[in-house]
Amino acid sequence: NECPELQPPVHGKIEPSQAKYFFKDQVLVSCDTGYKVLKDNVEMDTFQIECLKDGTWSNKIPTCKIVDCRAPGELEHGLITFSTRNNLTTYKSEIKYSCQEPYYKMLNNNTGIYTCSAQGVWMNKVLGRSLPTCLPECGQPSRSLPSLVKRIIGGRNAEPGLFPWQALIVVEDTSRVPNDKWFGSGALLSASWILTAAHVLRSQRRDTTVIPVSKEHVTVYLGLHDVRDKSGAVNSSAARVVLHPDFNIQNYNHDIALVQLQEPVPLGPHVMPVCLPRLEPEGPAPHMLGLVAGWGISNPNVTVDEIISSGTRTLSDVLQYVKLPVVPHAECKTSYESRSGNYSVTENMFCAGYYEGGKDTCLGDSGGAFVIFDDLSQRWVVQGLVSWGGPEECGSKQVYGVYTKVSNYVDWVWEQMGLPQSVVEPQVER
């Protein structure tokens, strides 16, 4: 009752290994690491056969098949490259995930290298079986900003891609009869969030109330250059409108808000986020130069009152920008305290502009980002949001523009966006 000699399968072994096998002897067929037992098209870890009374084996010896991790999972905003020939996905094959540069960067500088494990799963040394995360790159325009710039009032046209974070926010409040319509600017913080000034997103009809406009009344345009041609721009409706809970309509303290977009926008050369600053109560240092862009009033020969009261379109067709120095806080406070009217420059604000005037932000630029280049990270960081100024004409002598100090609100912004600060901090800190 001896059974025939057994040959172990290629890449496999038989246990126990004996010279002879008799009735009731059992053998266990297993495969080398990275291979699976294959019997009747069914994969298994081991397979047992028995020597029968009639001297035959209960089953044929199965084969050993190399483990296949199959096609790797798609990575949002990422690409996959195969390190092995013929795009193999079998045991010990290697793939590399990368993010769609220069618009996305891999979180925690992960290598993105995954190896097909013996268990048939793509594995990374740090993340295990979890996929990496591609985060939007911030503060790195596809086009470098020139050094010579003039004012938004009568100023310089921005080339497409210079301010890829710039958003045009159009609000049409249909809850009032007749409908109210106005616009402001904002800054893209991620694929789904826009930072702006609270007063842009406040219902305009009752000047003492802080009622946010309904999300249905907000449209955001990104990648927009010339307002006459919105065809190349991405337009998005709002999923949420979040005003800072302490926004004060009397003195514009805490003039900051967020819009969550209905759908994440695809990033590209004309649509990229700006970086948030580190949490620092001092804000930007005096005399630092920042840039602001906007589609606000740009005609230097017309007074604001004339522009408002005339029925003409007052939006600049092409995005304008200006370079402005941060003004020492005490100097700005003094300049406003010397004016008639109840002007309050709080610790949540900073000023920018020139004593002699001539360069300034103006109506319609509200909510736009005042950005400063961070030498450490080599990125543009949003330090301010266009908030208020006056009462004289924009660009008047010794009338500085007042900006919301974004660095005071970094925690609030992350909290609203639902992201832990540590996730995105390296974008600025590295």
Partner: antibody, heavy 113, light 112 residues
Framework: QVQLKQSGAELMKPGASVKLSCKAT????????IEWVKQRPGHGLEWIGE????????NYNEKFKGKATFTADSSSNTAYMQLSSLTTEDSAMYYC??????WGTGTTVTVSS | DIVMTQSPSSLAVSAGEKVTMSCKSS????????????LAWYQQKPGQSPKLLIY???TRESGVPDRFTGSGSGTDFTLTISSVQAEDLAVYYC????????FGGGTKLEIK
């Protein structure tokens, strides 16, 4: 077309409360503010406040806080204003209007002992 | 509160004449963001509800005859009726909605 039909005249005793109604037709009721205005001979027109039916948001004239309360029922396209602790000073014609444009038919409230 | 002052309180004119009435506010009604003056004019005929004539200081409501014209900006506003008709007998009110709304005291128009 847009119409606002208000409830009939009310004769009330001092100290009582009254609830006036304003039924809207011809537009999407939830999306527009409904304002309430008081008119007394010799006192002109006074703005009481407003409600946005879709959200229930309200704004009140400081003078009428505690006196007037606004509610709205979207299922019947009807806005309501309740006036409490009535005095003879509350005797007036009360109008509802859609935001700025269309006025209701008006409800006369008389408070008399 | 913003105080609205209308003048004259009443005036009597003959049919076909031009009439102007004034409305002044205690602070500017011009909203720099929307670039609108939040001032409306209403007409209230005897025994009727008020009716909107003009909004945003100068925009005529649809269906309102073009003899009614609104003008002004900031704090000074005017309603002009270019050729008064008998049916224009009414009280005319201005209303600001820049802030918590307030009405003017009204101008009563009588036909001689």
């Amino acid at each position: 077309q847009v119409q606002l039909k208000q409830s009939g005249a009310e004769l009330m005793k001092p100290g009582a409360s009254v609830k006036l109604s304003c039924k809207a037709t011809g537009y999407t009721f939830t999306g527009k503010w409904i304002e309430w205005v008081k008119q007394r001979p010799g006192h002109g027109l006074e703005w009481i406040g407003e409600i946005l039916p879709g959200t229930g948001s309200t704004n009140y004239n400081e003078k009428f806080k505690g006196k007037a309360t606004f509610t709205a029922d979207s299922s019947s396209n009807t806005a309501y204003m309740q006036l409490s602790s009535l005095t003879t000073e509350d005797s007036a014609m009360y109008y509802c209007l859609r935001s700025e444009d269309v006025w209701g038919t008006g409800t006369t409230v008389t408070v008399s002992s | 509160d913003i105080v609205m002052t209308q003048s004259p309180s009443s005036l009597a004119v003959s049919a076909g004449e031009k009439v102007t009435m004034s409305c002044k506010s205690s602070q500017s009604l011009l909203n720099s963001r929307t670039r609108k003056n939040y001032l409306a004019w209403y007409q209230q005929k005897p025994g009727q509800s008020p009716k909107l004539l003009i909004y945003w200081a100068s925009t005529r409501e649809s269906g309102v005859p073009d003899r009614f014209t609104g003008s002004g900006s900031g704090t000074d506003f005017t309603l002009t009726i270019s050729s008064v008709q008998a049916e224009d007998l009414a009280v005319y009110y201005c209303k600001q909605s820049y802030n918590i709304p307030t009405f003017g005291g009204g101008t009563k128009l009588e036909i001689k």
